[in-house]
Amino acid sequence: KSPIFGPQEVSSIEGDSVSITCYYPDTSVNRHTRKYWCRQGASGMCTTLISSNGYLSKEYSGRANLINFPENNTFVINIEQLTQDDTGSYKCGLGTSNRGLSFDVSLEVSQVPELPSDTHVYTKDIGRNVTIECPFKRENAPSKKSLCKKTNQSCELVIDSTEKVNPSYIGRAKLFMKGTDLTVFYVNISHLTHNDAGLYICQAGEGPSADKKNVDLQVLAPEPELLYKDLRSSVTFECDLGREVANEAKYLCRMNKETCDVIINTLGKRDPDFEGRILITPKDDNGRFSVLITGLRKEDAGHYQCGAHSSGLPQEGWPIQTWQLFVNEESTIPNRRSVVKGVTGGSVAIACPYNPKESSSLKYWCRWEGDGNGHCPVLVGTQAQVQEEYEGRLALFDQPGNGTYTVILNQLTTEDAGFYWCLTNGDSRWRTTIELQVAEATREPNLEVTPQNATAVLGETFTVSCHYPCKFYSQEKYWCKWSNKGCHILPSHDEGARQSSVSCDQSSQLVSMTLNPVSKEDEGWYWCGVKQGQTYGETTAIYIAVEERTRGSSHVNPTDANARAKVALEEEVVDSSISEKENKAIPNPGPFANEREIQNVGDQAQENRASGDAGSADGQSRSSSSKHHHHHH
């Protein structure tokens, strides 16, 4: 399928001009290659009429140009002084020959319609209203006023001043006079449809002395706006229907042959195909609203329409706006798993893509909620603190410049299952949707912290150990201190990895963290985790409470979070040999690092990018202090 996109049908009238925009994928080659506009002949040959190389055919001389807009990845063909001879089939395309990538465009140029000389032309969009002005002489002031629509032989009454109204105009047509002007009456017709288009006659009075006026009403379907979007990216339909429908329910639908199937409306209807990846947002009191769809699929391409009606469904004679969405499969957005699987008590690491050209943009992670119009409250962001209910179990790690940031969520419960969005304050196309599935755990956790009852005593030494299975033998292990700005990694030593024995003793695999002496600032959440290079895997969390020394004090666990962390995990969750296609929650890059490491990253491979947020939280970077040293048992 060609990735070139443009208008399928263009219509105009003789003497007018057209402007045709064609879109191409965002690549350097495409930006610089030849662009062309050619006319298709009966033989299938396509004869160049104009190209970006400077060629201009004789029949286009002095009336056409082609302009490339590389910053928009579009080129525009402008043609003036149209004649009926310009009607035909064309291609806009890219390449050194006219057999390159292209898009078919049909151009129809029709004759200017012949109208009576005194005809007043009104041009209105479907669903809108028109007010027709009907002047008359003073002597006809007391007489009957009327508007009729011309049919083949007669003129069919629309409305008159004696309250006679054609049934098809009841509730839509009003005849009135303004102010003290006794020489004009008006007819307003609302909820215009294609059937309303045609010639009308205004009349005041009867017989030969009657005042008459010819009116031509043109009712136009809105031109679809072209939207060119990459696969897996997002699109926003900005719908501005006007103040007159501000209080009506709004909808977005997709054309399906003759009908338009509602995808979402403000009454709570939502197509299941868009679950987790769509929001409808009222913008203001003037009837403006937008619909955002993320995680675009190739089957999302098509003709969309937004509108307003109390039913929340498309209704003839109500204002609409339309779009033609093209989904370019040559996407710059990396193909990531759209489903991540975890188990209760376990953890997931989610890699979120962003536009690498916008490394300084703010990164966010939000949870999609489908109630009402749908919304996505931010749970964590590079400059947004973690939401309270996610304390100790959620962190976002930015890796400037590599096009990925990582979100880790641990202590999973079944309530965490749902849809999440990766988004930035930069290029909105790079919004992606992840579905998190959480199954009940069926086996022991891979990572287990002892003691479970983690209460440290002020001024004393306190050690916690993180036990891991032999399958993590070759992976790096770490401890980090969580804050709502990230998880600051602490230097540690791994006893298991130092053993020279080839065999793996299940009971002796542990990595320990010692606080010596314990201070009040040490209280908080700590994570133990494993990683392979820059790919972060499973984590488990523990809350360490700090108490003052008291005689015979019994340590009470301040939270049930440690109990949660004990729930069993499926071993496969961190098996890095599993292929992406299985949609397991295999480890994703999680750039825990401290500040000193960050400065040396430079332009290494993207997995090695590390985050200032992850390790530079004020008051957290105490890893060099003698109070935090890590040893083995």
Partner: nanobody
Framework: QVQLVESGGGLQQAGGSLRLSCAAS????????VGWFRQAPGKEREFVAA????????YYADSVKGRFTISRDNAKNTVDLQMNSLKPEDAAVYYC??????????????????WGQGTQVTVSS
């Protein structure tokens, strides 16, 4: 603006007659239709009759057809309602209403934008 004032209400025996009058003032050239409505205690306001100002046409509720007549006097800017063969169920407050547009729906009270204060009609049996 258009101002409307009703007169002619009162007590009448069943079978008798009354003539109500509605005097319009202000920007009366914009008035397209004038109607009479009535409201009995505890009941909805209901349409009685209407007359168009530009090209004379009259409309009546089924319940008063043949008994009531609506007419206009353009020179005096008045609209009258002649009520004959009165019945006890005709007793109500009668309102004169005007609207500045025609739409083919002349019998809905919420389509009228100007209203008088009303005049009481009582019918004794």
């Amino acid at each position: 603006q258009v101002q409307l004032v009703e007169s002619g209400g009162g007590l009448q025996q069943a079978g008798g007659s009354l003539r109500l009058s509605c005097a319009a003032s202000g920007r009366t050239v914009t008035v397209m239709t004038v109607g009479w409505f009535r409201q009995a205690p505890g009941k909805e306001r209901e349409f009685v009759a209407a007359i168009t100002m530009y090209g004379e046409r009259t409309y009546y509720a089924d319940s008063v057809k043949g008994r009531f007549t609506i007419s206009r006097d353009n020179a005096k800017n008045t609209v009258d309602l002649q009520m004959n063969s009165l019945k006890p169920e005709d007793a109500a407050v009668y309102y004169c209403a005007a609207r500045t547009y025609v739409s083919g729906i002349y019998d809905r009270f919420d389509d009228y934008n100007y209203w008088g204060q009303g005049t009481q009609v009582t019918v004794s049996s």
